[in-house]
């Protein structure tokens, strides 16, 4: 049973490693909220599906952040 | 390199508390999850506790009410009170895999070699 | 809490020979959340699989998860002498964290 009820954060471990952006499925980035006081980023990756927590703080991740949305950029008409 | 090391364990009186502690090592401690887990003598693995990489939030057995965790010390703690006959074991503590979530579980990919615990009159 | 099974309590095997290590679970686990681990003698436990199928780093070949649902099992597909050890899952899918309770692969 969680200590606190109220808090719903989802990632247990961070992971400050880089992600190669043509791996990625999808990229979720969570804002704070009165349910997770932090911001929290969620990669899907392509193999397997699997969930990874990424480190918000990492400049690595920051990098990601930036190649995805200039990428999304990309493709908007 | 990558290293946990416990300490805190030994012989004590049932009623009595304990604070078990876990040194991390070589990783960026404040990035991960951690865990307790103990084992009896001749018996299984038990699953403790686990506190989240910022310490917010905190999962339990039955057994144990006191995982805690201070970042600035890179330690992981394990306050044992009311200790009885049956709290006597081996207590590792253990990393949680990098990235892991409530959708995703990487397993605990670092362990420490366990710190032993006798609870006796 | 979730239960989980493993059979068989003992294994015998030769080196050489196909492991097939089965664990169940008492109410459905995410295939994300199973993991499985080998402890030796005097050690500490060690990482093989997480995600029901994912080896571990550094975790050889010859090591391999599959399942889902309730029904998972660990395979050892030629055994090596290293390899005689317990053997436990432990699902993630809900607190409190269980493992199973061991299979022993014994040397025959």
């Known amino acids: 049973v969680p200590l606190s009820r109220t808090v719903r954060c989802t990632c247990i471990s961070i992971s400050n490693q880089p992600v190669n952006p043509r791996s990625l499925e999808k990229l979720e980035i969570i804002p704070a909220s009165q349910f997770c006081p932090r911001v929290e980023i969620i990669a899907t990756m392509k193999k397997k599906g699997e969930k990874r927590c990424l480190n918000p703080e990492s400049k690595a991740i920051k990098n990601l952040l930036k190649a995805v949305s200039k990428e999304r950029s990309k493709r908007s008409p | 390199q990558v290293q946990l090391v416990e300490s805190g364990g030994g012989v004590v009186q049932p009623g009595r508390s304990l604070r078990l502690s876990c040194a991390a090592s070589g990783f960026t401690f404040s990035s991960y999850g951690m865990h307790w887990v103990r084992q009896a003598p001749g018996k299984g693995l038990e699953w403790v506790a686990v506190?989240?990489?910022?310490?917010s939030i905190k999962y339990y057995a039955d057994s144990v009410k006191g995982i805690s965790r201070d970042n600035s010390k890179n330690t992981l703690y394990l306050q044992m009170n009311s200790l009885r006959a049956e709290d006597t074991a081996v207590y590792y503590c253990a990393r949680e895999g990098a990235g892991s979530s409530l959708y995703y579980y990487y397993g605990m990919d670092v362990w420490g070699q366990g710190t032993t615990v006798t609870v006796s009159s | 809490e979730i239960v989980l099974t493993q059979s068989p309590g003992t294994l015998s095997l030769s080196p050489g020979e196909r492991a097939t290590l089965s664990c169940r679970a008492s109410?459905?686990?995410?295939?994300?959340?199973l993991a499985w681990y080998q402890q030796k003698p005097g050690q500490a436990p060690r990482l093989l699989i997480y995600g029901a199928s994912s080896r571990a780093t550094g975790i050889p070949g010859r090591f391999s998860g599959s399942g889902s649902g309730t029904d998972f099992t660990l395979t050892i597909s030629r055994l090596e002498p290293e390899d005689f050890a317990v053997y436990y899952c432990?699902?993630?899918?809900?607190?409190?964290?269980?493992f199973g309770q061991g299979t022993k692969l014994e040397i025959k």
């Open positions: 432990q699902q993630y899918g809900s607190s409190p964290y269980t």
């Open positions: 109410q459905s686990v995410s295939s994300g959340h």
């Open positions: 506190i989240w990489f910022e310490g």
